[in-house]
């Protein structure tokens, strides 16, 4: 008789990351009988939704359904039909929607409402759309990378199954950079977390974790750029802004109304004698770095030590995974290697920013100009944020690992979010099955 393969006893989950600049859909899969084991959930698909973030649909909510169609149809294809009704779908919106809610709760509700209506028409188990807090975003990112790195597993190994593994149970810190916010999350060394808002307590797999987290709203790379432009145009003598964060020869016209559209630039808002201004790139890393530093208020700190803007930050501890835009930007700049020192990164950034715009366009012909033009700013911003914002040093730089994926799953908050909502991270260590295969090499 012919051997028939037994049907795979697997489960699926879908998380949509509705970020400020775009939406991505992630499909996760795991063996049904190993739900509580650590490291069994893995990503089988990522689908990037074509178009901007959902907060940009505030004046065209009727287009949201079409916007989500391609990726939801992709999910329909990837997940077996027999599993559709049991597959939970979650949508988490981050800082782009936090900013919209600050402007108008009613408009944010309208966008979320239409998103929910659209997603509820698919045959999955839709579990709602919500704006997650910055604290959640930080916490779930931390859970994701440590889950994928095997840090919650009690089984010690003499061999390494994943890159970056330091072969101990000490967790990695998480550094997440988005378009509108950035998060820093880690377990401090025997340090009291002086501000309760930044303290999280977890019990995972039988172990307690006291975690520090903070989300800096308006300090994602896109909103930081808007802030910098709004700050610099205040002192411009006319409608020309000579900007060191853009390549020499680069020119772009900016509408003042667009500049002041975001709550992030409110503190710099002033009446200008023009409706538009032109950015003219001069490509100088050092001057760009200095301009960025003016966004960080380090003159005030009500705690033993701060990051910036009076926000408590304990002394950095251990290794850190830097993901999302930290990774994408550094990957583009070819600066993700473990061997590249902070001094080398700075040197490379100086050279890159000084390259003429025409040369850059030729060298990276396949890259959209909108993105290409901002890598000098973004790279400089990452260095400024990590060194002056979070107080990494040339020495501690080597503890930052720029991570895109771990074991095939994207680093980011979505996996941690799903693990939490599906109750797949037990507080206590599950009873190990007899003769667990992990006993053997």
């Amino acid at each position: 008789t012919q051997n028939k393969a037994l049907p795979e006893n697997v489960k699926y989950g879908i998380v949509l990351d509705a970020g400020s600049s775009h939406t991505s859909l992630y499909i996760y899969k795991w063996p049904a009988e190993k739900e509580n084991d650590t490291g069994v959930v893995h990503q089988v698909e990522e689908c990037r939704v074509k178009g901007p973030g959902i907060s940009k649909f505030v004046q065209k909510v009727n287009e949201i359904g079409i916007y989500l169609t391609d990726c939801m149809e992709r999910a329909r294809e990837v997940i077996p039909r027999s599993q559709h009704q049991e597959t939970p779908v979650y949508l988490g919106a981050t800082a782009g929607m936090r900013l919209l809610r600050m402007e108008s709760e009613e408009l944010a509700d309208r966008v979320l409402d239409v998103v929910e209506r659209s997603l509820s028409n698919y045959p999955f188990d839709f579990q709602g759309a919500r704006i997650i807090t910055g604290q959640e975003e930080g916490a779930y990112g931390w859970i994701t990378i440590n889950y994928l790195l095997g840090k919650f597993s009690q089984k010690t190994r003499w061999f390494s199954i994943v890159p970056y593994e330091t072969n101990n149970q000490e967790t990695f810190g998480a550094l997440d950079l988005g378009g509108a916010s950035t998060q820093v999350t880690f377990v401090p060394q025997n340090q009291t977390i002086e501000s309760p808002d930044n303290a999280l307590q977890f019990r995972l797999y039988g172990k307690d974790y006291n975690v520090y987290t903070h989300s800096f709203l308006c300090y994602g790379k896109d909103q930081a750029l808007w802030q910098k432009l709004a700050k610099d145009i205040q002192v411009a003598s006319n409608e020309i802004l000579r900007d060191p964060c853009f390549h020499p020869g680069y020119k772009k016209v900016v509408n003042v109304s667009d500049l002041y559209k975001t709550p992030c630039t409110k503190r710099f808002e002033m009446t200008l004698p023009f409706q538009q201004f032109e950015i003219q790139g001069i490509g100088n890393y050092q001057q760009c770095h200095q301009s960025i530093l003016e966004l960080f208020n380090t003159s005030y700190c009500p705690y033993s030590q701060c990051a910036f803007n009076g926000i408590f930050l304990p002394p950095l501890q251990g290794d850190f995974g830097a993901f999302s835009a930290f990774y994408f930007v550094m990957k583009f700049l070819n600066l993700t290697s473990e061997k590249v020192s902070q001094e080398k990164v700075t040197e490379m950034m100086k050279k890159f920013c000084a390259q003429p715009w025409e040369e850059i366009k030729t060298s990276y012909a396949g890259v959209k100009e909108k993105y290409l033009s901002e890598y000098c700013f973004s790279g400089t911003y990452i260095l400024s944020l990590l060194l002056q914002g979070y107080h990494f040093t040339a020495d501690s730089w080597e503890h930052i690992h720029f991570i895109g994926k771990i074991q095939g799953s994207d680093a980011g908050w979505t996996l941690g979010y799903m693990l939490n909502l599906t109750n797949m991270i037990p507080a206590e260590q599950p009873l190990s099955t007899p003769l667990s295969h992990s006993t053997y090499v």
Epitope: V61, L112, D113, V114, E116, R117
Partner: antibody, heavy 121, light 107 residues
Framework: QVQLVQSGAEVKKPGSSVKVSCKAS????????ISWVRQAPGQGLEWMGS????????NYAQKFQGRVTITADESTSTAYMELSSLRSEDTAVYYC??????????????WGRGTLVTVSS | EIVMTQSPATLSVSPGERATLSCRAS??????LAWYQQKPGQAPRLLIY???TRATGIPARFSGSGSGTEFTLTISSLQSEDFAVYYC?????????FGGGTKVEIK
Amino acid sequence: QVQLVQSGAEVKKPGSSVKVSCKASGGTFASYAISWVRQAPGQGLEWMGSIIPEFGIANYAQKFQGRVTITADESTSTAYMELSSLRSEDTAVYYCAREAGYYRYRYFDLWGRGTLVTVSS
Amino acid sequence: EIVMTQSPATLSVSPGERATLSCRASQSVSSNLAWYQQKPGQAPRLLIYGASTRATGIPARFSGSGSGTEFTLTISSLQSEDFAVYYCQQHALWPLTFGGGTKVEIK
């Protein structure tokens, strides 16, 4: 004072379709979502689907997907619910109801008087 | 979908007495729960939304409480016009779902 005025009772044959209307009079219509809820004789309430007339965005309960179509005409402030492939179990009073607001405000603060649809051969 | 379960199915109460109706959700709906009253031959009428907020024109004898999965509607002193069927409805997630109803009848 806004009122939701529904079309009259209908008797239909199994396999046919019915289209019930719900007209808003005396107030704004477009910016509120309208849901359709049915109630079989002696039974409870069952949500069928909803539409935001302003955007033409409809969503449906999985049970009715493919069999129900909800539309709206902003110019006449009227919402419609069409149910096809009728069977005897579809005999019920069909209500239109206004949702109080967006997102987490999807409770019904205004109801039509109901339209009795009887499916019988 | 979220299953809403009401208990008891029927509640016999004397006028002037207190009536306590329960509603349980199969998963957390936070405080996104509404209560309706329906009399024979009439459409339902909104009493409570957001688990505890009284709708416009609803007498103070009606009060709602609870959050997550367990909810209660209390009628502090039943009047003759309160004898009816009461439904709970979750307004947290699509599809919107109703409980099976509790009939409050005269004892």
